[in-house]
Interface confidence: medium
Amino acid sequence: EVEKTACPSGKKAREIDESLIFYKKWELEACVDAALLATQMDRVNAIPFTYEQLDVLKHKLDELYPQGYPESVIQHLGYLFLKMSPEDIRKWNVTSLETLKALLEVNKGHEMSPQVATLIDRFVKGRGQLDKDTLDTLTAFYPGYLCSLSPEELSSVPPSSIWAVRPQDLDTCDPRQLDVLYPKARLAFQNMNGSEYFVKIQSFLGGAPTEDLKALSQQNVSMDLATFMKLRTDAVLPLTVAEVQKLLGPHVEGLKAEERHRPVRDWILRQRQDDLDTLGLGLQG
């Protein structure tokens, strides 16, 4: 808390400029008008204020806007955003994607902080759903963002947003999350032709049911082994040897090395030995 002291004569700030870096903390408090600061927030980032000076500026804004900052100020916070607490951010109403981008840019290259997580939560709740543009923005800054959401939160993702998802965005998703995302992806890509469809749906197949895998096996897709290893065990178990052979195409050779790993191990145990022998891989059920 900074003590209230009168501003020395001639030091009253007329605008936010470089001269303020020479002000002591108490001088900033006394000589910078909070309303002036709010209207010239965009200038703060160009001035090399110390962390302590930024604390004073934040304090002034907090006093001016006890109920939370308006978006016109939030959009220009820049490095002052790093001074905000999740409690501060919970008071905000952020509706503009430009504001979100501006603040994510400040945190770029760092792990997702509690502040950023709170900001995103406020933004998404304000919009009511994770639309494509938002998802595009969030996954560009945080590739793992999608997989940080609960299955319940993912259920609010509209199928149209799935077009923004890149394979690496799903790297850390668990089966429960893919169970939610897969039907949306299937809907989003339903009008694509066979090979194009497979390229798009491939990353989501960890949520695919048996009937969809059977359908894919009829389409000459040559699923790669890395994708096969991520399929749900319960979806793989009912597949016949012939279906798995069609599904994997030339990649079926890789099954031998994975015979001790799920889902291959459990699938092998469900097959007749005569059928396994047709693969010529020496798999033992």
């Epitope: 790669d224 082994l225 890395a226 290893m229 030339p250 031998k256």
Partner: nanobody, 124 residues
């Protein structure tokens, strides 16, 4: 689940060198390096077949990159010399239980596991 963790990426000037490492939680007969630049398809770089140590290289890296492994440590390496801007990409290691021939095809579809990758940046 098999874990693959790459390291050693970074920024380097054209003509410089880097050595990438990949620590694997389990071994397989075939280990390889793949790379993917933004907006481009994944491309095979080099592979090594553990039982006899035979190696395969993509034409674009022959004579500049060397793949090797330490079987005792389940670690794969990629020594990259004379790096060029076009070598900049995310480098992923991959393992699979493949035959000698298939290992040499350098096709991603045959591999069961891929690591998350390590970024290599080359400035001219």
């Amino acid at each position: 689940e098999v874990q693959l963790v790459e390291s050693g990426g970074g920024s380097v000037q054209a003509g410089g060198s880097l050595t990438l490492s990949c620590a694997a939680s389990e071994s397989r007969d075939c280990m390889a390096w793949f790379r993917q630049a933004p907006g481009k398809a994944r491309e095979g770089v080099a592979s090594i077949y553990a039982p006899d140590g035979s190696t395969t290289y993509a034409d674009t890296v022959k004579g500049r990159f060397t793949i090797s492994q330490d079987n005792a440590k389940n670690t794969l390496y990629l020594q990259m010399n004379s790096l060029q801007p076009e070598d900049a990409a995310m480098y992923h290691c991959a393992i699979g239980g493949l035959s000698r021939n298939t290992c040499g095809y350098l096709r991603g579809g045959y591999f069961a596991y891929f690591g998350r990758g390590t970024q290599v940046t080359v400035s001219s």
